[in-house]
């Protein structure tokens, strides 16, 4: 049994038919001695009597809000919650697994430049009872400070006959330098609670690997003069790390016909801007990518050919 | 990546051209050995990052682009010392600061290339010949190096008496790949960055 | 999902015992509680007795204090109550419960799982 946070308690359990359990002895927090009364959850049957409540937690149901009164007045809580683990692996029962860009993936986390800030996401069909709490640091013996804000729910949508929800979060490396190498990775926490269930998910990365740039500004097409060739310029996102000299990004030109079967011409170039054929119905689209270190490419940005 | 290579210009600042075929070349090579020494802990995941030119060399800082000066997490240990001008500089007025970075770029080069070459005399007498470096990656390496034109003591190639692990040599290969492959990364953009001032 | 299958009931004399069993499976390591409700003829569902986890609590409606006695055999994910001095008034269809909930074990309406009742009758 550990602490996860005040008045919170996480008992691991190995769960297998007839399993022993775990003997969990609770103390009431008070200078008092008699006239200990415990209850648990919003039940007011008592449980129990005296400064200590000895249980055995073999299964959810176990677990709870354990309060300690004494004529008519609470003393002290204990929540206990269960961290399960079967075949001596932790269940991953809350979080989806995203299966991207591997199996078992259930934290996905991108950043938009090197300035240390980036964004983490999960999904879960659960919709009530839920709470996520995120730590972060660079390193994890002698860890450097990242600070994350509030998990919030970002995204539903419907898959079939269910109902998917998205969170994310938004951390800050505390003192991060964007010409950096990096040598020790971000580690990611998500602690998640479903009703008296906890879990732990973590996630490790270099910045590096996860850019993913916003996709090009100002997409604006100039006709040539007595030619089917256009002028297709853009600029560099307003997001993406300065000086550009330093961080440059490349391009892919797509020239893409109305229907997804005809063939798509592109184009790649470190210039911000390029010549095409603009066909008639056709759009032309951009995306960036760090020039030096091929993480992901952006989004497209895209306008019509007409 | 199928990108059309560009020819520099003649006029263009003389170590770009140069730098991008180093990071193409050790790129190759990181992809080679993680194909070849797939049942070795080659991945990024997998390996730890060890930096040769730590404490001996100061690239990044060095190198820092003005814009970032005012950064206060980057200028955890500047360097302010010595070194003359390279070719690299040629016909341009160089700040002490510049003149510092490409020193310092040259002396990694250095390091890793005495490195390499002892790892791939190590690797020739691997009697499964499983992998070697790839000479076209020596060669840029050479040719950066002669592009920047630093006088400096030449280091000796380490020979080692003992019987080579062979194994422990394939990791600390990928180990040397990979801190290659991002300090390149940095020589790139640190030549792009000079090559726009 | 958890799925439920009450056995046990029967006609018996008043003054006699009878054991109930509800036999749990599939994801049954979700349920917080598991309690037996009931329902005579023209009335409503009325609350008997709950067991929370293995039986860290137990908590019983005023009607059946000392005479019944909910348990749980966790290795056999099997509830029991065991019906002693039994009256007229007994009389119901008995259904076995699951509860994902916490709170309000008392409460049929917070209950995920039923399972399809066994009628109990007290009669001479």
């Known amino acids: 049994i550990w602490e996860l946070k005040k008045d919170v308690y996480v008992v691991e359990l190995d769960w297998y038919p007839d399993a022993p359990g775990e003997m969990v002895v609770l103390t009431c927090d008070t200078p008092e001695e008699d006239g200990i009364t415990w209850t648990l959850d919003q039940s007011s049957e008592v449980l129990g009597s005296g400064k200590t409540l000895t249980i055995q937690v073999k299964e959810f149901g176990d677990a709870g809000q354990y309060t300690c009164h004494k004529g008519g007045e609470v003393l002290s809580h204990s929540l206990l919650l269960l961290h399960k683990k079967e075949d001596g692996i932790w269940s991953t029962d809350i979080l989806k697994d995203q299966k991207e860009p591997k199996n078992k993936t259930f934290l996905r986390c991108e950043a938009k430049n090197y300035s240390g800030r980036f964004t983490c996401w999960w999904l879960t069909t659960i919709s009530t009872d839920l709470t996520f709490s995120v730590k972060s640091s660079r390193g994890s013996s002698d860890p450097q400070g990242v600070t994350c804000g509030a998990a919030t729910l970002s995204a539903e949508r419907v898959r079939g006959d269910n109902k998917e929800y998205e969170y994310s979060v938004e951390c800050q490396e505390d003192s991060a330098c964007p010409a950096a190498e990096e040598s020790l990775p971000i580690e990611v926490m998500v602690d998640a609670v479903h009703k008296l269930k906890y879990e732990n998910y973590t996630s490790s990365f270099f910045i590096r690997d996860i850019i993913k740039p916003d996709p090009p500004k100002n997409l604006q097409l100039k006709p040539l003069k007595n030619s089917r060739q256009v002028e297709v310029s853009w600029e560099y996102p307003d997001t993406w790390s300065t000086p550009h000299s330093y961080f440059s990004l490349t391009f892919c030109v797509q020239v893409q016909g109305k229907s997804k079967r005809e063939k798509k011409d592109r184009v790649f170039t470190d210039k911000t801007s390029a010549t095409v054929i603009c066909r008639k119905n056709a759009s032309i689209s951009v995306r960036a990518q760090d020039r030096y270190y091929s993480s992901s490419w952006s989004e497209w940005a895209s306008v019509p050919c007409s | 990546r199928n990108l059309p290579v560009a020819t520099p210009d003649p006029g263009m600042f003389p170590c770009l051209h140069h730098s991008q075929n180093l990071l193409r070349a050790v790129s190759n090579m990181l992809q080679k050995a993680r194909q070849t020494l797939e049942f070795y802990p080659c991945t990024s995941e997998e390996i730890d990052h060890e930096d040769i030119t730590k404490d001996k060399t100061s690239t990044v800082e060095a190198c820092l682009p003005l814009e970032l000066t005012k950064n206060e997490s980057c200028l955890n240990s500047r360097e302010t010392s010595f070194i003359t001008n390279g070719s690299c500089l040629a016909s341009r007025k160089t700040s002490f600061m510049m003149a510092l970075c490409l020193s310092s770029i040259y002396e990694d080069l250095k390091m890793y290339q005495v490195e390499f070459k002892t790892m791939n005399a190590k690797l020739l007498m691997d009697p499964k010949r499983q992998i070697f470096l790839d000479q076209n990656m020596l060669a840029v390496i050479d040719e950066l190096m002669q592009a920047l034109n630093f006088n400096s003591e030449t280091v000796p190639q380490k020979s080692s008496l003992e019987e080579p692990d062979f194994y422990k040599t394939k990791i600390k290969l990928c180990i040397l790949l990979h801190a290659f492959r991002i300090r390149a990364v940095t020589i790139d953009r640190v030549m792009s960055y000079l090559n726009a001032s | 999902e958890v799925q439920l299958v009450e056995s046990g009931g029967g006609l018996v004399q008043p003054g006699g015992s009878l054991r109930l069993s509800c036999a749990a499976s599939?994801?049954?390591?979700?349920?917080?509680?598991m309690g037996w409700f009931r329902q005579a003829p023209g009335k409503g569902l009325e609350f008997v007795a709950v067991?929370?986890?293995?039986?860290?609590?137990?908590y019983y409606a005023e009607s059946v204090k000392g005479r019944f006695t909910i348990s749980k055999d966790s290795s056999k994910n099997t509830v029991y109550l065991q019906m002693n001095s039994l009256r007229a008034e007994d009389t119901a269809v008995y259904y076995c419960?699951?509860?994902?909930?916490?709170?309000?074990?008392?409460?049929?309406?917070?209950?995920?799982?039923w399972g399809q009742g066994t009628q109990v009758t007290v009669s001479s």
């Open positions: 419960a699951a509860t994902t909930n916490r709170f309000k074990n008392r409460e049929y309406t917070t209950y995920d799982y």
């Open positions: 067991i929370r986890g293995s039986g860290v609590a137990t």
């Open positions: 599939g994801r049954t390591f979700e349920t917080i509680a």
